[in-house]
Protein backbone atom coordinates (compact mmCIF):
# COMPACT_ATOMS: atom_id res chain seq x y z
CA UNK A 1 0.00 0.00 0.00
CA UNK A 2 1.01 3.60 -0.20
CA UNK A 3 0.77 6.15 2.58
CA UNK A 4 0.32 9.85 2.05
CA UNK A 5 -0.23 12.50 4.66
CA UNK A 6 -3.03 14.57 3.25
CA UNK A 7 -6.62 15.11 4.31
CA UNK A 8 -7.62 17.07 1.19
CA UNK A 9 -7.58 15.91 -2.40
CA UNK A 10 -5.10 13.03 -2.28
CA UNK A 11 -3.74 14.07 -5.67
CA UNK A 12 -2.53 17.41 -4.30
CA UNK A 13 0.02 15.47 -2.26
CA UNK A 14 1.64 13.90 -5.31
CA UNK A 15 5.01 15.61 -5.87
CA UNK A 16 6.88 16.30 -9.09
CA UNK A 17 8.10 13.11 -10.67
CA UNK A 18 4.87 11.29 -9.81
CA UNK A 19 1.29 11.26 -11.04
CA UNK A 20 -2.01 10.65 -9.29
CA UNK A 21 -2.99 7.21 -10.54
CA UNK A 22 -6.79 7.03 -10.72
CA UNK A 23 -6.60 3.40 -11.77
CA UNK A 24 -4.93 2.54 -8.48
CA UNK A 25 -6.91 4.36 -5.77
CA UNK A 26 -5.26 7.71 -6.52
CA UNK A 27 -1.86 6.70 -5.21
CA UNK A 28 1.12 8.77 -6.28
CA UNK A 29 2.80 6.52 -8.80
CA UNK A 30 6.30 7.40 -10.01
CA UNK A 31 6.41 8.56 -13.60
CA UNK A 32 7.31 5.60 -15.80
CA UNK A 33 10.62 5.69 -17.66
CA UNK A 34 10.69 8.21 -20.53
CA UNK A 35 8.00 10.36 -18.93
CA UNK A 36 8.04 13.22 -16.44
CA UNK A 37 5.92 15.56 -14.34
CA UNK A 38 7.48 18.91 -13.58
CA UNK A 39 4.87 19.97 -11.01
CA UNK A 40 2.96 18.30 -8.22
CA UNK A 41 -0.64 17.15 -8.35
CA UNK A 42 -0.53 15.97 -11.96
CA UNK A 43 -2.84 13.19 -13.13
CA UNK A 44 -0.56 12.07 -15.92
CA UNK A 45 3.12 12.19 -16.74
CA UNK A 46 4.16 13.76 -20.03
CA UNK A 47 6.23 11.80 -22.53
CA UNK A 48 9.85 12.93 -22.66
CA UNK A 49 10.92 14.79 -25.76
CA UNK A 50 13.28 12.73 -27.90
CA UNK A 51 16.13 14.57 -29.58
CA UNK A 52 16.52 12.58 -32.78
CA UNK A 53 17.92 13.12 -36.23
CA UNK A 54 19.16 16.68 -36.64
CA UNK A 55 18.34 17.37 -32.98
CA UNK A 56 20.78 16.42 -30.26
CA UNK A 57 20.27 16.23 -26.50
CA UNK A 58 21.39 19.29 -24.58
CA UNK A 59 19.80 18.14 -21.31
CA UNK A 60 18.57 14.63 -20.57
CA UNK A 61 14.99 14.01 -19.52
CA UNK A 62 14.40 13.14 -15.87
CA UNK A 63 11.32 12.23 -13.86
CA UNK A 64 10.78 15.94 -13.13
CA UNK A 65 11.92 17.75 -16.27
CA UNK A 66 11.69 17.32 -20.01
CA UNK A 67 14.67 16.79 -22.24
CA UNK A 68 16.08 19.87 -23.98
CA UNK A 69 17.38 19.67 -27.52
CA UNK A 70 19.72 21.73 -29.63
CA UNK A 71 20.89 21.13 -33.19
CA UNK A 72 23.73 19.08 -34.58
CA UNK A 73 26.71 20.98 -36.05
CA UNK A 74 25.78 22.69 -39.31
CA UNK A 75 22.29 23.55 -38.02
CA UNK A 76 20.84 26.09 -35.61
CA UNK A 77 17.71 26.28 -33.47
CA UNK A 78 14.51 28.05 -34.46
CA UNK A 79 11.31 28.48 -32.48
CA UNK A 80 10.48 28.23 -28.81
CA UNK A 81 12.45 25.48 -27.10
CA UNK A 82 14.34 24.74 -30.31
CA UNK A 83 11.29 23.31 -32.03
CA UNK A 84 13.06 23.31 -35.40
CA UNK A 85 16.59 23.04 -36.72
CA UNK A 86 17.56 25.12 -39.75
CA UNK A 87 20.62 24.57 -41.90
CA UNK A 88 23.54 26.92 -41.33
CA UNK A 89 24.93 28.87 -44.28
CA UNK A 90 28.31 30.57 -44.52
CA UNK A 91 28.73 34.20 -43.67
CA UNK A 92 27.86 36.16 -46.80
CA UNK A 93 24.97 33.81 -47.59
CA UNK A 94 21.31 33.31 -46.75
CA UNK A 95 19.13 30.22 -46.76
CA UNK A 96 16.57 30.07 -49.56
CA UNK A 97 14.24 27.29 -50.71
CA UNK A 98 17.01 26.24 -53.08
CA UNK A 99 19.67 26.17 -50.36
CA UNK A 100 22.38 28.63 -49.37
CA UNK A 101 22.80 31.55 -51.79
CA UNK A 102 25.34 34.36 -51.77
CA UNK A 103 24.10 37.74 -50.66
CA UNK A 104 23.22 40.04 -53.56
CA UNK A 105 25.44 43.07 -54.13
CA UNK A 106 24.58 45.75 -51.61
CA UNK A 107 23.58 43.26 -48.91
CA UNK A 108 25.51 41.33 -46.28
CA UNK A 109 25.13 38.64 -43.62
CA UNK A 110 27.74 38.38 -40.90
CA UNK A 111 26.18 35.26 -39.34
CA UNK A 112 25.59 31.64 -40.33
CA UNK A 113 21.85 32.15 -39.99
CA UNK A 114 19.30 34.76 -40.96
CA UNK A 115 18.88 36.79 -44.12
CA UNK A 116 21.10 39.16 -46.05
CA UNK A 117 20.50 42.79 -44.99
CA UNK A 118 21.21 45.95 -46.96
CA UNK A 119 24.40 47.82 -46.29
CA UNK A 120 24.00 50.90 -44.16
CA UNK A 121 23.36 54.01 -46.25
CA UNK A 122 25.97 56.34 -44.75
CA UNK A 123 24.65 59.37 -46.62
CA UNK A 124 21.33 59.16 -44.73
CA UNK A 125 23.28 60.15 -41.63
CA UNK A 126 25.27 62.69 -43.52
CA UNK A 127 28.35 60.51 -43.37
CA UNK A 128 30.63 58.98 -45.95
CA UNK A 129 31.73 55.40 -46.55
CA UNK A 130 34.99 54.77 -44.73
CA UNK A 131 35.24 51.05 -45.48
CA UNK A 132 33.34 49.40 -48.30
CA UNK A 133 30.85 46.70 -47.55
CA UNK A 134 31.20 43.06 -48.56
CA UNK A 135 28.88 40.06 -48.58
CA UNK A 136 30.04 39.32 -45.04
CA UNK A 137 30.39 42.81 -43.59
CA UNK A 138 28.45 46.04 -43.50
CA UNK A 139 30.03 49.26 -44.69
CA UNK A 140 31.81 51.36 -42.10
CA UNK A 141 30.61 54.94 -42.08
CA UNK A 142 33.07 57.72 -41.40
CA UNK A 143 32.85 61.46 -40.86
CA UNK A 144 30.75 63.53 -43.27
CA UNK A 145 32.49 64.80 -46.41
CA UNK A 146 32.32 68.37 -45.04
CA UNK A 147 34.25 67.32 -41.97
CA UNK A 148 37.04 66.08 -44.22
CA UNK A 149 37.42 69.31 -46.35
CA UNK A 150 40.87 71.01 -46.30
CA UNK A 151 41.39 73.19 -43.28
CA UNK A 152 38.53 71.70 -41.38
CA UNK A 153 39.40 70.31 -38.00
CA UNK A 154 37.60 67.42 -36.51
CA UNK A 155 38.70 68.49 -33.05
CA UNK A 156 36.26 70.68 -31.17
CA UNK A 157 38.04 73.71 -29.62
CA UNK A 158 37.83 73.95 -25.83
CA UNK A 159 35.26 76.25 -24.31
CA UNK A 160 36.76 79.55 -23.04
CA UNK A 161 37.66 79.52 -19.38
CA UNK A 162 35.35 81.46 -17.12
CA UNK A 163 36.44 83.42 -14.06
CA UNK A 164 34.74 82.57 -10.80
CA UNK A 165 31.72 84.67 -9.99
CA UNK A 166 30.97 85.68 -13.56
CA UNK A 167 28.01 84.36 -15.51
CA UNK A 168 28.23 83.85 -19.24
CA UNK A 169 27.27 86.80 -21.41
Amino acid sequence: FERTRSLQDPCSNCPAGTFCDNNRNQICSPCPPNSFSSAGGQRTCDICRQCKGVFRTRKECSSTSNAECDCTPGFHCLGAGCSMCEQDCKQGQELTKKGCKDCCFGTFNDQKRGICRPWTNCSLDGKSVLVNGTKERDVVCGPSPADLSPGASSVTPPAPAREPGHSPQ
Epitope: G17, P30, S62
Partner: antibody
Framework: EVQLVESGGGLVQPGGSLRLSCAAS?????????PCWVRQAPGKGLEWIGC?????????YDAQWTKGRFTISRDNSKNTVYLQMNSLRAEDTAVYYC?????????????WGQGTLVTVSS | IQMTQSPSSLSASVGDRVTITCQAS??????LAWYQQKPGKAPKLLIY???TLASGVPSRFSGSGSGTDFTLTISSLQPEDFATYYC???????????FGTGTKVTVL
Protein backbone atom coordinates in the same frame (compact mmCIF):
# COMPACT_ATOMS: atom_id res chain seq x y z
CA GLU B 1 32.47 6.44 -5.29
CA VAL B 2 28.77 5.81 -5.79
CA GLN B 3 27.66 3.39 -3.08
CA LEU B 4 25.13 2.42 -0.42
CA VAL B 5 26.29 1.26 3.00
CA GLU B 6 23.90 -0.42 5.45
CA SER B 7 24.45 -0.56 9.19
CA GLY B 8 22.52 -1.37 12.36
CA GLY B 9 22.05 -5.10 11.95
CA GLY B 10 22.67 -7.59 14.73
CA LEU B 11 21.03 -9.93 17.19
CA VAL B 12 17.68 -8.92 18.64
CA GLN B 13 15.16 -10.77 20.77
CA PRO B 14 11.67 -11.62 19.51
CA GLY B 15 9.32 -8.70 20.10
CA GLY B 16 12.24 -6.28 20.02
CA SER B 17 12.97 -3.36 17.71
CA LEU B 18 15.86 -2.39 15.48
CA ARG B 19 16.63 0.53 13.21
CA LEU B 20 18.73 -0.04 10.12
CA SER B 21 20.50 2.79 8.32
CA CYS B 22 21.57 3.13 4.72
CA ALA B 23 24.01 5.90 3.87
CA ALA B 24 24.32 6.98 0.24
CA SER B 25 27.51 8.48 -1.12
CA UNK B 26 28.46 9.73 -4.57
CA UNK B 27 24.86 10.69 -5.40
CA UNK B 28 21.79 12.17 -3.72
CA UNK B 29 18.36 10.64 -3.36
CA UNK B 30 15.91 12.59 -5.52
CA UNK B 31 12.73 12.23 -7.55
CA UNK B 32 14.87 10.11 -9.90
CA UNK B 33 16.37 7.87 -7.21
CA UNK B 34 14.18 6.20 -4.59
CA PRO B 35 15.80 4.37 -1.66
CA CYS B 36 14.33 0.92 -1.05
CA TRP B 37 14.71 -1.97 1.35
CA VAL B 38 14.79 -5.63 0.31
CA ARG B 39 15.45 -8.63 2.54
CA GLN B 40 16.57 -12.22 2.02
CA ALA B 41 16.07 -14.92 4.62
CA PRO B 42 18.80 -17.58 4.77
CA GLY B 43 18.53 -19.85 1.73
CA LYS B 44 15.41 -18.03 0.51
CA GLY B 45 14.54 -15.58 -2.25
CA LEU B 46 14.44 -11.79 -2.35
CA GLU B 47 11.53 -10.08 -0.61
CA TRP B 48 10.61 -6.45 -1.28
CA ILE B 49 9.94 -4.41 1.86
CA GLY B 50 9.31 -0.95 0.45
CA CYS B 51 10.64 2.30 -0.94
CA UNK B 52 10.32 5.99 -0.17
CA UNK B 53 10.08 8.89 -2.61
CA UNK B 54 13.58 10.24 -3.07
CA UNK B 55 12.70 13.95 -2.97
CA UNK B 56 11.32 16.00 -0.10
CA UNK B 57 7.88 14.35 0.10
CA UNK B 58 7.13 11.61 2.65
CA UNK B 59 5.37 9.23 0.26
CA UNK B 60 6.22 5.61 0.98
CA TYR B 61 5.51 2.44 -0.96
CA ASP B 62 5.31 -0.59 1.32
CA ALA B 63 4.68 -4.29 0.92
CA GLN B 64 1.40 -5.24 2.53
CA TRP B 65 3.01 -7.97 4.62
CA THR B 66 4.87 -5.36 6.67
CA LYS B 67 1.50 -4.48 8.30
CA GLY B 68 2.89 -1.33 9.84
CA ARG B 69 5.64 -3.17 11.70
CA PHE B 70 8.26 -1.75 9.37
CA THR B 71 8.57 1.95 8.61
CA ILE B 72 10.85 3.58 6.06
CA SER B 73 12.03 7.15 6.63
CA ARG B 74 14.70 9.41 5.21
CA ASP B 75 16.99 12.22 6.31
CA ASN B 76 17.89 14.18 3.20
CA SER B 77 20.45 16.31 5.02
CA LYS B 78 22.41 13.15 5.81
CA ASN B 79 21.52 11.42 2.53
CA THR B 80 20.47 8.46 4.66
CA VAL B 81 17.41 6.22 4.68
CA TYR B 82 16.20 4.20 7.65
CA LEU B 83 14.20 1.05 8.23
CA GLN B 84 12.52 0.96 11.64
CA MET B 85 11.52 -2.61 12.50
CA ASN B 86 9.22 -3.30 15.45
CA SER B 87 7.67 -6.44 16.98
CA LEU B 88 10.36 -8.54 15.38
CA ARG B 89 9.81 -12.28 14.90
CA ALA B 90 12.12 -15.19 14.21
CA GLU B 91 10.96 -15.19 10.58
CA ASP B 92 12.33 -11.65 10.16
CA THR B 93 15.84 -13.10 10.37
CA ALA B 94 17.46 -12.14 7.08
CA VAL B 95 20.08 -10.13 5.29
CA TYR B 96 18.59 -6.67 4.75
CA TYR B 97 19.66 -4.83 1.61
CA CYS B 98 19.34 -1.18 0.79
CA UNK B 99 18.86 -0.56 -2.94
CA UNK B 100 18.47 2.42 -5.23
CA UNK B 101 15.45 2.30 -7.51
CA UNK B 102 16.28 4.53 -10.47
CA UNK B 103 14.00 6.22 -13.00
CA UNK B 104 16.87 5.99 -15.47
CA UNK B 105 16.80 2.19 -15.10
CA UNK B 106 13.06 1.72 -15.39
CA UNK B 107 12.80 1.88 -11.59
CA UNK B 108 14.96 -1.22 -11.35
CA UNK B 109 17.47 -1.49 -8.51
CA UNK B 110 20.65 -0.33 -10.19
CA UNK B 111 22.72 0.05 -7.01
CA TRP B 112 22.76 -2.20 -3.93
CA GLY B 113 24.46 -2.15 -0.58
CA GLN B 114 26.41 -5.10 0.78
CA GLY B 115 23.58 -6.05 3.14
CA THR B 116 23.36 -6.22 6.92
CA LEU B 117 22.36 -9.36 8.81
CA VAL B 118 19.51 -9.20 11.30
CA THR B 119 19.07 -12.23 13.57
CA VAL B 120 15.92 -12.49 15.69
CA SER B 121 16.45 -15.08 18.36
CA SER B 122 16.13 -15.55 22.09
CA ILE C 1 0.97 -8.24 -7.63
CA GLN C 2 2.43 -11.75 -7.44
CA MET C 3 5.34 -12.80 -9.61
CA THR C 4 5.80 -16.46 -10.49
CA GLN C 5 9.03 -17.72 -12.02
CA SER C 6 9.66 -21.00 -13.75
CA PRO C 7 11.48 -23.22 -13.54
CA SER C 8 12.57 -22.89 -9.92
CA SER C 9 15.86 -24.52 -10.87
CA LEU C 10 17.58 -25.82 -13.98
CA SER C 11 20.83 -27.52 -14.87
CA ALA C 12 22.70 -26.57 -18.01
CA SER C 13 26.11 -26.69 -19.63
CA VAL C 14 28.41 -23.95 -20.81
CA GLY C 15 27.28 -22.82 -24.27
CA ASP C 16 23.65 -23.80 -23.72
CA ARG C 17 20.76 -21.46 -24.45
CA VAL C 18 18.81 -20.88 -21.25
CA THR C 19 15.29 -19.45 -20.95
CA ILE C 20 13.60 -18.37 -17.72
CA THR C 21 9.99 -17.18 -17.59
CA CYS C 22 8.22 -14.84 -15.22
CA GLN C 23 4.48 -14.34 -14.95
CA ALA C 24 2.75 -11.41 -13.22
CA SER C 25 -0.66 -11.85 -11.59
CA UNK C 26 -1.86 -8.72 -13.40
CA UNK C 27 -0.65 -6.60 -16.29
CA UNK C 28 2.45 -4.56 -15.50
CA UNK C 29 3.05 -3.29 -19.04
CA UNK C 30 6.83 -3.46 -19.57
CA UNK C 31 7.74 -2.60 -15.99
CA LEU C 32 9.88 -5.59 -15.21
CA ALA C 33 13.49 -6.00 -14.13
CA TRP C 34 15.74 -9.06 -14.05
CA TYR C 35 18.56 -9.61 -11.53
CA GLN C 36 21.41 -12.03 -11.12
CA GLN C 37 22.54 -13.02 -7.63
CA LYS C 38 25.54 -15.09 -6.61
CA PRO C 39 25.92 -16.65 -3.13
CA GLY C 40 26.81 -14.12 -0.44
CA LYS C 41 26.49 -11.19 -2.85
CA ALA C 42 23.90 -8.49 -3.49
CA PRO C 43 21.73 -8.81 -6.60
CA LYS C 44 22.91 -7.22 -9.83
CA LEU C 45 20.55 -5.54 -12.28
CA LEU C 46 20.65 -7.23 -15.69
CA ILE C 47 17.62 -5.95 -17.57
CA TYR C 48 15.04 -3.23 -16.97
CA UNK C 49 11.86 -2.14 -18.75
CA UNK C 50 11.50 -5.81 -19.73
CA UNK C 51 14.07 -5.67 -22.54
CA THR C 52 16.67 -2.95 -21.93
CA LEU C 53 20.13 -4.22 -21.04
CA ALA C 54 21.62 -2.55 -17.95
CA SER C 55 25.00 -0.87 -18.26
CA GLY C 56 27.92 -3.29 -18.46
CA VAL C 57 25.77 -6.40 -18.92
CA PRO C 58 26.94 -8.77 -21.69
CA SER C 59 24.77 -8.93 -24.80
CA ARG C 60 24.18 -12.67 -24.36
CA PHE C 61 21.49 -11.64 -21.86
CA SER C 62 18.19 -10.50 -23.34
CA GLY C 63 14.68 -9.91 -22.09
CA SER C 64 11.30 -9.84 -23.75
CA GLY C 65 7.62 -9.72 -22.95
CA SER C 66 4.91 -7.28 -21.94
CA GLY C 67 1.73 -7.36 -19.89
CA THR C 68 1.89 -10.50 -17.76
CA ASP C 69 4.41 -12.81 -19.47
CA PHE C 70 8.15 -12.18 -19.58
CA THR C 71 11.27 -14.09 -20.56
CA LEU C 72 14.96 -13.85 -19.72
CA THR C 73 17.24 -15.57 -22.23
CA ILE C 74 20.94 -16.33 -21.95
CA SER C 75 21.98 -17.12 -25.51
CA SER C 76 25.19 -18.98 -24.65
CA LEU C 77 25.72 -19.81 -21.00
CA GLN C 78 29.15 -18.88 -19.63
CA PRO C 79 30.83 -20.23 -16.46
CA GLU C 80 30.17 -16.95 -14.63
CA ASP C 81 26.44 -17.16 -15.38
CA PHE C 82 25.75 -19.96 -12.90
CA ALA C 83 23.71 -18.07 -10.33
CA THR C 84 20.15 -17.41 -9.18
CA TYR C 85 17.96 -15.14 -11.32
CA TYR C 86 15.02 -13.05 -10.10
CA CYS C 87 12.39 -11.02 -11.89
CA UNK C 88 10.82 -7.99 -10.21
CA UNK C 89 7.81 -5.90 -11.05
CA UNK C 90 8.72 -2.23 -10.99
CA UNK C 91 5.07 -1.17 -11.06
CA UNK C 92 5.03 0.93 -7.91
CA UNK C 93 2.36 0.75 -5.21
CA UNK C 94 -0.10 -1.92 -4.05
CA UNK C 95 2.71 -4.45 -3.58
CA UNK C 96 3.77 -3.53 -7.10
CA UNK C 97 7.47 -4.17 -6.58
CA UNK C 98 7.29 -7.87 -5.74
CA PHE C 99 10.11 -10.22 -6.70
CA GLY C 100 9.70 -13.50 -8.47
CA THR C 101 10.39 -16.75 -6.69
CA GLY C 102 13.83 -17.15 -8.28
CA THR C 103 15.46 -19.58 -10.70
CA LYS C 104 18.71 -21.29 -9.74
CA VAL C 105 20.93 -22.15 -12.70
CA THR C 106 23.45 -24.90 -11.88
CA VAL C 107 26.05 -26.89 -13.80
CA LEU C 108 24.75 -30.01 -15.47
Amino acid sequence: EVQLVESGGGLVQPGGSLRLSCAASGFSFSANYYPCWVRQAPGKGLEWIGCIYGGSSDITYDAQWTKGRFTISRDNSKNTVYLQMNSLRAEDTAVYYCARSAWYSGWGGDLWGQGTLVTVSS
Amino acid sequence: IQMTQSPSSLSASVGDRVTITCQASQSISNRLAWYQQKPGKAPKLLIYSASTLASGVPSRFSGSGSGTDFTLTISSLQPEDFATYYCQSTYYGNDGNAFGTGTKVTVL
